[in-house]
């Protein structure tokens, strides 16, 4: 859960109570037990550009 009074994390990141900052959800592939990864499961991934129409 994000700490009160902090700015919301950008898309593709999630709040880490253990570090008191937003962390990149991409790192959860390598280390899924990080505390912020629970928030990543509920959040959509960062937008990406399609390589085809």
């Amino acid at each position: 859960e994000q700490a009160p009074g902090t700015a919301p994390c950008s898309r593709g990141s999630s709040w880490s109570a253990d570090l008191d900052k937003c962390m990149d959800c991409a790192s959860c592939r390598a280390r899924p037990k990080s505390d912020f990864c629970l928030g990543c499961a509920a959040a959509p991934p960062a937008p990406f550009r399609l390589l085809w129409p």
């Epitope: 880490s16 253990d18 570090l19 008191d20 280390r31």
Partner: antibody, heavy 120, light 108 residues
Framework: EVQLLESGGGLVQPGGSLRLSCAAS????????MMWVRQAPGKGLEWVSY????????HYADSVKGRFTISRDNSKNTLYLQMNSLRAEDTAVYYC?????????????WGQGTLVTVSS | DIQMTQSPSSLSASVGDRVTITCRAS??????LNWYQQKPGKAPKLLIY???SLQSGVPSRFSGSGSGTDFTLTISSLQPEDFATYYC??????????FGQGTKVEIK
């Protein structure tokens, strides 16, 4: 120069309490996670406890859970470890260490340690 | 908890020798592996983080390699000040970080 200086160790009877302190200097203390690690005489390193930069999140090894409490005072640049219900197996040198700014990745600076002896 | 096993537990070597210490994790820890050096009566000192990254100020004769479950710390040419105990530490299974039992490097 980064410095971490532990204090508060000593001889205590089983069941007793001690409060360790770790005074930080040479860096801005508040953004860094901190931890305590201990080393029993002649033995290896054992992680004891972790605290987030704000102090809002804490973690403990199973061996000390419910008996030890980690805290910090960022205005005083100081880390604490309150140790209650001490046992003979808690006898060790206790080190404080500074975490990196990524997730639990490494601990780059350590204090010189303070010896806690639990004995009757 | 993830168990970290170092080998050998001790070794004897001479100045100038190439020394290799291994650390094995009980399950894959990716590259979340650090190495520390500890001299008698002193605090541990970070040597290598993220399996192969040299900590600032550490001599280049120290190097680390490996990923998954098997890791190696190598001292390319042992110096008198390198006689110490070396510990590996995993930071994958947080917050329950664990250390290896240590490898003592002694003078032959």
């Amino acid at each position: 120069e980064v410095q971490l200086l532990e204090s508060g160790g000593g001889l205590v009877q089983p069941g007793g309490s001690l409060r360790l302190s770790c005074a930080a200097s040479g860096f801005t203390f508040s953004p860094y996670p901190m931890m305590w690690v201990r080393q029993a005489p002649g033995k290896g390193l054992e992680w004891v406890s972790y605290i987030s930069p704000s102090g809002g999140s804490t973690h403990y090894a199973d061996s000390v859970k419910g008996r030890f409490t980690i805290s910090r005072d960022n205005s005083k640049n100081t880390l604490y470890l309150q140790m209650n219900s001490l046992r003979a197996e808690d006898t060790a040198v206790y080190y404080c260490a500074r975490g990196g700014d990524t997730y639990f990745d490494y601990f780059d600076y350590w204090g010189q340690g303070t010896l806690v002896t639990v004995s009757s | 908890d993830i168990q970290m096993t170092q080998s050998p537990s001790s070794l004897s070597a001479s100045v100038g020798d190439r020394v290799t210490i291994t650390c094995r994790a009980s399950q894959s820890i990716s590259s979340y592996l650090n190495w520390y050096q500890q001299k008698p009566g002193k605090a541990p000192k970070l040597l290598i983080y993220a399996a192969s990254s040299l900590q600032s100020g550490v001599p280049s004769r120290f190097s680390g390699s490996g990923s998954g479950t098997d890791f190696t710390l190598t001292i390319s040419s042992l110096q008198p000040e390198d006689f110490a105990t070396y510990y590996c530490q995993q930071s994958y299974s947080t917050p329950g970080i664990t250390f290896g039992q240590g490898t003592k490097v002694e003078i032959k």
